[in-house]
């Protein structure tokens, strides 16, 4: 990669966490949602 | 998280294998640094392994460590021939031209 | 080969004062911003403060201001606390992906 060793950045791992977490409050969410509804 | 271990007392000359194990994230897409620090002394850059298994080292650390993956959740460190001068704590540390997930470190010991 | 020098060795200063803290790289560093800020205490591994010159890692109090490009970086500790006692290390990425250290301050907080 032309990036080399700097592909790793911070800046990207603090989107990727925003992502992970966005992703678990969803989900987490629709679960709830599927729970109340049974 | 990242861990460091096999830090022990060895003989000069003895080579030695550090283990640095993560958890929570892939080295598929993870730069790991090795990074040492002699009692009282500073921080001291090894070398780096990228998401693509490429090694990096420090001028002086070539020919004297060799970094390896070892697994997806492993990365080693080999000190080939230790000298007394390698005695210090070695850090395990995520990032590429950035450190910023930090293992406690293991203590290795040269001594006769 | 690449070599941070980083002054002074040693600042003291009292609770609420500001302390700065020099970096100086003998090549420019990736991008003209890979240098990165650490805090270390004894018995610890450092604690990632500033990434890319001036950006504040997650969770760093805004009293830590980092600043420069290329190869003159510096940190700055305002609203000193007796917390901040530590030393401080920077860190520089290369685009031929060598990275380093310099040698550290020692923060005194009287």
């Known amino acids: 990669h032309s990036d080399g060793i700097f592909t790793d950045s911070y800046s990207r791992y603090r989107k990727q966490m925003a992502v992970k977490k966005y992703l678990a409050a969803v989900l987490g969410k629709r679960y709830k949602q599927r729970v109340k509804n049974k | 998280s990242v861990e460091e271990s096999g830090g022990r007392l060895v003989t000069p000359g003895t080579p030695l294998t550090l283990t640095c194990t993560v958890s929570g994230f892939s080295l598929s897409s993870a730069a790991m640094n090795w990074v040492r620090q002699a009692p009282g002394k500073g921080l001291e850059w090894i070398g780096i392994?990228?998401?693509?298994?490429?090694t990096y080292y420090a001028p002086w650390a070539k020919g004297r460590f060799t970094i390896s993956k070892t697994s997806s959740t492993t990365v080693d460190l080999k000190m080939t021939s230790p000298t007394t001068e390698d005695t210090a704590t070695y850090f395990c540390?995520?990032?590429?031209?950035?450190?910023?997930?930090w293992g406690p470190g293991t203590l290795v010991t040269v001594s006769s | 080969a690449q070599v941070l020098t980083q002054t002074p060795s040693s600042v003291s200063a009292a609770v609420g004062g500001t302390v700065t803290i020099n970096c100086q790289s003998s090549?420019?560093?990736?991008?003209?911003?890979?240098l990165s800020w650490y805090q270390q205490k004894p018995g610890q591994p450092p604690n990632f403060l500033i990434y890319?010159?001036?950006n504040l890692a997650s969770g760093v109090p805004s009293r830590f201001k980092g600043s420069g490009s290329g190869t003159q970086f510096t940190l700055t500790i305002s609203d000193l606390e007796c917390d901040d006692a530590a030393t401080y290390y920077c860190a520089g990425g290369y685009s031929s992906n060598i990275c380093g250290f310099g040698g550290g301050t020692e923060v005194v907080v009287k």
């Open positions: 090549q420019s560093v990736h991008d003209g911003s890979y």
């Open positions: 890319q010159a001036s």
């Open positions: 540390a995520r990032g590429g031209g950035e450190f910023f997930i």
């Open positions: 392994i990228d998401n693509t298994a490429g």
